[in-house]
């Protein structure tokens, strides 16, 4: 779980000729507000498809009245960030739509009128926890400058917000292989329970034994990049075997369609398929009415028979916002006790409890580790009402008192031989395989999208797994 944050820096005329007319006038003062819609992945989706990652609406900006004869300046902006909470993993790649709306404050019958001034869209890669990313997008003669970032909500950490933190069981340090949880330095990363071998960088899980891939990665353990090396055709995807994408030159390169329109090639040129509310050769003309379906999530549109009159969205249960774009956050009721993480699954609320607590609302305190000692540097792990020791490398058993054979679990795949080593284990791979655990086949034609052997290491050489 986490939050995507968007900071609008400026909205005004773009560089070059053809400055846009000011959206407000002395007769019709107005103010701006913004809407952001997020979708996971890099796929081209229609503008009206659901904002599966979430959506948010800004506050209204200050009232602005055009000064007669003056060019349209950067318009006054609403205060604060736009925040889009996400409850699942951050996907790493995402599509966004940012809309600039005008609220006219003249003497309209029935209250203020809204109209869409500009819509920009794009696709980006972004790791959670990283710095603010800056961007500039143009829509017709308008230019929007903004920054964005994704951050995890405690106790989630990591680039996908899928690793969890838990309180330290020992005051001085975290257990073997577990790092302190920045910025919660008094907590430690909880050990991952994903499918054995699932890539910690490119895979994630929400259930024990799962391995689900972030966009751009594939394979059962999410270790294979979605690559272009094995594509068969010179243009377009050959995803049946590799999931790869090859962009090629063509009239749709750079997408000449504005406002989230999708481009398709024609024998002579290109054709834009425009999202609702836009039309024109390049989807550059806008004007939203009830006929354009501005209400999301099944909201009922009332009024707004023409672009200059207002419409109102009546939202179904569970949604709110002027366009029904916001899901009601039932987790704001804070049902989970003792620092439990609330998950709104749509059909039910669930609490993911911190270590040491259990029950549907994390109301039961389990003091499993009190008075328990794990030998040889092991760490006591609470859970399920029975203490368990997470043992340091080379030790095993209930209290970490037994010497462990690192090869007992047969970690070397594809017939590789395992050798115990003072710093861990070493796999000697069978011919045709390589990798720390012999997990990668060596394709003789060199067309594999898998990582090559490190320099100086031949397939079949023993590889140390630390």
């Amino acid at each position: 779980a986490g939050v995507f944050e968007l900071q609008i820096h400026s909205f005004g005329p773009g560089p070059g000729p053809g400055a846009p007319r000011s959206p407000c006038s002395a007769r019709l003062p107005c103010r701006l507000f913004f809407r952001v819609c997020l979708k996971p992945g890099l796929s081209e989706e229609a503008a009206e498809s659901p904002c599966a990652l979430g959506a948010a609406l800004s506050a209204r900006g200050p009232v602005y009245t055009e000064q007669p004869g003056a060019p349209a300046p950067d318009l006054p902006l609403p205060d604060g960030l736009l925040q889009v909470p996400f409850r699942d993993a951050w996907p790493g790649t995402f599509s966004f739509i940012i809309e600039t709306w005008r609220e006219e404050l003249g003497d309209q019958i029935g209250g203020p009128a809204w109209s869409l001034l500009a819509r920009v869209a794009g696709r980006r890669r972004l790791a959670a926890g990283g710095p603010w990313a800056r961007d500039i997008q143009r829509a017709g003669a308008w230019e929007l400058r903004f920054s964005y970032r994704a951050r995890c909500e405690p106790p989630a950490v990591g680039t996908a917000c899928t690793r969890l933190c838990r309180p330290r069981s020992a005051p001085s340090r975290c257990g073997p292989g577990l790092r302190p949880c920045a910025p919660l330095e008094d907590e430690c990363e909880a050990p991952l329970v994903c499918r054995a071998g699932c890539s910690p960088e490119h895979g994630f899980c929400e259930q024990p034994g799962e391995c689900r891939c972030l966009e751009g990665w594939t394979g059962p353990l999410c270790t294979v990049p979605v690559s272009t090396s094995s594509c068969l055709s010179p243009r377009g995807p050959s995803s049946a075997t590799t999931g790869c994408l090859v962009p090629g030159p063509g009239p749709c390169d750079g997408n000449p369609c504005a406002n989230g329109g999708s481009c398709s090639e024609t024998p002579r040129s290109f054709e834009c398929t425009c999202p609702r509310g836009f039309y024109g050769l390049r989807c550059e003309v806008s004007g939203v009415t009830c006929a354009d379906g501005p209400c999301f999530n099944g909201g009922l549109c009332v009024g707004g028979a023409d672009p200059d009159s207002a419409y109102i969205c009546h939202c179904p249960p569970g949604f709110q916002g002027s366009n029904c774009e916001k899901r009601v956050d039932r987790c704001s009721l804070q049902p989970c006790r003792n620092g439990g993480l609330c998950l709104d699954l749509g059909h039910a609320l669930r609490c993911r409890c911190r270590a040491g607590f259990a029950g549907p609302r994390c109301e039961h305190d389990l003091d499993d580790c009190a008075g328990r000692a794990c030998a040889n540097g092991g760490t006591c792990v609470e859970g399920g009402g029975a203490h368990r020791c997470s043992c340091a490398l080379g030790f095993g058993g209930r209290d970490c008192r037994e010497r462990a054979d690192p090869c007992a679990a047969r970690p070397c795949a594809h017939g590789g031989r395992c050798y115990a080593h003072f710093s861990g284990l070493v796999c000697a791979c069978a011919p045709g395989y390589m990798g720390a655990r012999c997990e990668f086949p060596v394709h003789p034609d060199g067309a594999s999208a898998l990582p090559a052997a490190p320099p100086g290491l031949r397939p079949g050489d023993p590889q140390r797994y630390l």
Epitope: R195, A196, P220, G243
Partner: antibody, heavy 113, light 112 residues
Amino acid sequence: SLEESGGRLVTPGTPLTLTCTASGFSLNTYHMIWVRQAPGKGLEWIGIVDSGGSTYYASWAKGRFTISRTSTTVDLKATSLTTEDTATYFCARGGSWDGFNIWGPGTLVTVSS
Amino acid sequence: DVVMTQTPSSVSAAVGGTVTINCQSSQSVYNSDFLAWYQQKPGQPPKLLIYAASTLASGVPSRFKGSGSGTQFTLTISDLECDDAATYYCQGTYEDVGWFNDFGGGTEVVVK
């Protein structure tokens, strides 16, 4: 839950699209497979769209079937059906490639002249 | 192409007894352990029993046990109950040019 739709009686050579619709969760971060079962026969794997968006197909299904995904649906498009394609078609959700724990009830496709 | 052979095709045992189903693959499954077992009853979709060769799926009783690695796998059902009468399938994950799954031919379990 998952539910397949689009199954019907068609004539040979007809294209057909089956849709798997999810309720209660988003499909974007799960592996989704299509499997079929001819009457009185065993399960036959058609293909998968993994959580990263890549698609893979059984060797016999390449070129005959296409899988695509949105956040709430996964489609299986058949280009040209034959009588051997008569079967119940299932979609299933998995968190890993070898554990598909949520299945739809299936939709019956009958190909007959 | 990979061939997954399930034996026997049909097995009968009494309530309280034990049955063993074998699944043999013509090539090693991915990572030696990407193998799952499913139970299917007439008119119903399959139900996941075991994944990762030996890990019990949520809500599945411990009477079901999976074992094996590489190309040879076994599903053992002990303390048979009438409700266990069904067809059981193994499913392997393999690596080729891309990735793919394959199912075994199925084993019908009859409980007397």
